[in-house]
Amino acid sequence: VTGSRVYPANEVTLLDSRSVQGELGWIASPLEGGWEEVSIMDEKNTPIRTYQVCNVMEASQNNWLRTDWITREGAQRVYIEIKFTLRDCNSLPGVMGTCKETFNLYYYESDNDKERFIRESQFGKIDTIAADESFTQVDIGDRIMKLNTEIRDVGPLSKKGFYLAFQDVGACIALVSVRVFYKKCPLTVRNLAQFPDTITGADTSSLVEVRGSCVNNSEEKDVPKMYCGADGEWLVPIGNCLCNAGHEEQNGECQACKIGYYKALSTDASCAKCPPHSYSVWEGATSCTCDRGFFRADNDAASMPCTRPPSAPLNLISNVNETSVNLEWSSPQNTGGRQDISYNVVCKKCGAGDPSKCRPCGSGVHYTPQQNGLKTTRVSITDLLAHTNYTFEIWAVNGVSKYNPSPDQSVSVTVTTNQAAPSSIALVQAKEVTRYSVALAWLEPDRPNGVILEYEVKYYEKDQNERSYRIVRTAARNTDIKGLNPLTSYVFHVRARTAAGYGDFSEPLEVTTNTVPSRIIGDGANST
């Protein structure tokens, strides 16, 4: 029966005399008068089984003590730690030259675990053991014995086990503890590779190459290897493993990404929070699911936010010229969170009596610069039929539009070819300019060509260069443009619309808003 004693993780104990409860019962030769098993108290008042011999008065002592058989458990080199105490020869009563202060350590390899007798000739000498410290009888006071600790190693061993023997040649000595152990490199995890318990090599300089196996939920990047050194220390880690997708390294393990996190690839990166507009509901996510109404394009990385189709283009303007139509519009208010926005034009030819009966325009119609994938916000459509109703749809599209096409993503206009539109307006005036508004007025076109249904005012900041404009429609020949920025130059165009369509825009009127209110009467020229 052995009690538990704590030793370093890289040592595996094969024998520990201090852990044995009761008598050790080792074999002594001679049976009496030599080594004697004695129980003493240690510093914690716990009994320890020790072997002592003190035949210091007679010369030519040859007292042997042999351990029980010790299995080697596959170890090729074992270590023997001996704790012993030795009395100074000078402290012994009447002793002269017969007293020694050393003893000898021997071993004998054997497959037989039940050898009953000590045959001295079978044993090989490991070393002569001398004390670093011996003591006089006065030194033993306060129960503090001067313990010497000596460690020797022996190998390579090849048989199933071995016996140790201690030869006394006339010392006054006690073996307080004998521990036999071998060294191993303990199971460890390095670079996410697990290396098993590995017994050290036969030589004190040998290195044992060990291949590691990737921990759960990881895969090899480079073949993981380490070397087990003779002292039981792992050396020179080579190669590594990486946590699989959906897992990250934590304390040498690959843990599943938490809910709300993901990892797309086998890398040494940590799990990342789900990108905007996405979520994960399970641990170990390799990607995050897009929120309802949000999507990920085929070539979008898992790290990109989920996006949605854009809203409809704004401010669609048409200009009919016989069998040609020019269309212009503004970017959608919501791009869906993407940069890859483009526009598609859908042309439908509709019956005069029933506008709902429309058919695709066909291949005879031409679009400049193109019909689909437009990057600009204008298109010219030519080769239309005369006296025909056409409906044009402008669709805003991005990389995820195909996942959720909806009429909400388009704006349309219906025109009739070959009807004369009104002429352009000759004079536009700024009646009043304040910090935040401009009051405009204009004359009816010289040639209305029908009933003027409404006027359309297009304006924009001069330095925006028509990239971002706004439209105001009115039935009157004047309007107040509000919500402007002070001290800013604006450009204004006005055109009229009849049933035949829009006329051309007027010449630009440039007006700069004030810092203080004032009245300016425009005369058609640029006002400042």
């Epitope: 004695v38 003493i40 108290m41 008065m57 010369a59 105490t85 030795l86 006065v138 129960r143 006690a174």
Partner: antibody, heavy 121, light 106 residues
Framework: QVQLLQSGAEVKKPGASVKVPCKAS????????MSWVRQAPGQGLEWMGW????????TYAQGFTGRFVFSLDTSVSTAYLQISSLKAEDTAVYYC??????????????WGQGTLVTVSS | EIVLTQSPATLSVSPGERATLSCRAS??????LPWYQQKPGQAPRLLIY???TRATGIPDRFSASGSGTDFTLTISRVEPEDFAVYYC????????FGQGTKVEIK
Amino acid sequence: QVQLLQSGAEVKKPGASVKVPCKASGYTFTSRAMSWVRQAPGQGLEWMGWINTNTGNPTYAQGFTGRFVFSLDTSVSTAYLQISSLKAEDTAVYYCARVRTTVYGDNMDVWGQGTLVTVSS
Amino acid sequence: EIVLTQSPATLSVSPGERATLSCRASQSVSSNLPWYQQKPGQAPRLLIYGASTRATGIPDRFSASGSGTDFTLTISRVEPEDFAVYYCQQYGPSWTFGQGTKVEIK
């Protein structure tokens, strides 16, 4: 078994000498030192000294030098205590005791039965 | 030389009781202090040696402890055959005994 056998009581006159034998049996005589202890009537134990049975080298305690001699005859495994110029205060039981020397200290593990020496005129 | 003082000089106990004997040294000595028992008309016999190792044939009701200058011999339950004189001994360069404690029937 291990035994130390001492002679019977001795009655001596002051100034005389006495030689007390201690015969050992049951172990190798020369392997253990022999100690001598005195016990005056009604008194405690008093260590007199020892002799190395292997070399014959004696060690005397303070107060037991001069008139006290330890000697050996290894051929008959016997140790001797000789007291000369006996005085009345030498009246005591004299014990021989085998010295057990261990790592953990020295003691006397086997004792003779004692020899009473009476000094009286 | 080192003087060992034992106390009490006489200890009166009834059979079955616990007896505690003290031995005090004039200076620090080894903790491996031997104790001896001597019955009237008999030679002393070794009782305890080492730190607290009982000699052959000594029952386990005898135990010893102590270190430095103060030592104790304890008889856990005194038996009739334990009534005797008990001596402690130190084995410095010059060996000495305590003057003894007599354990007698109460």
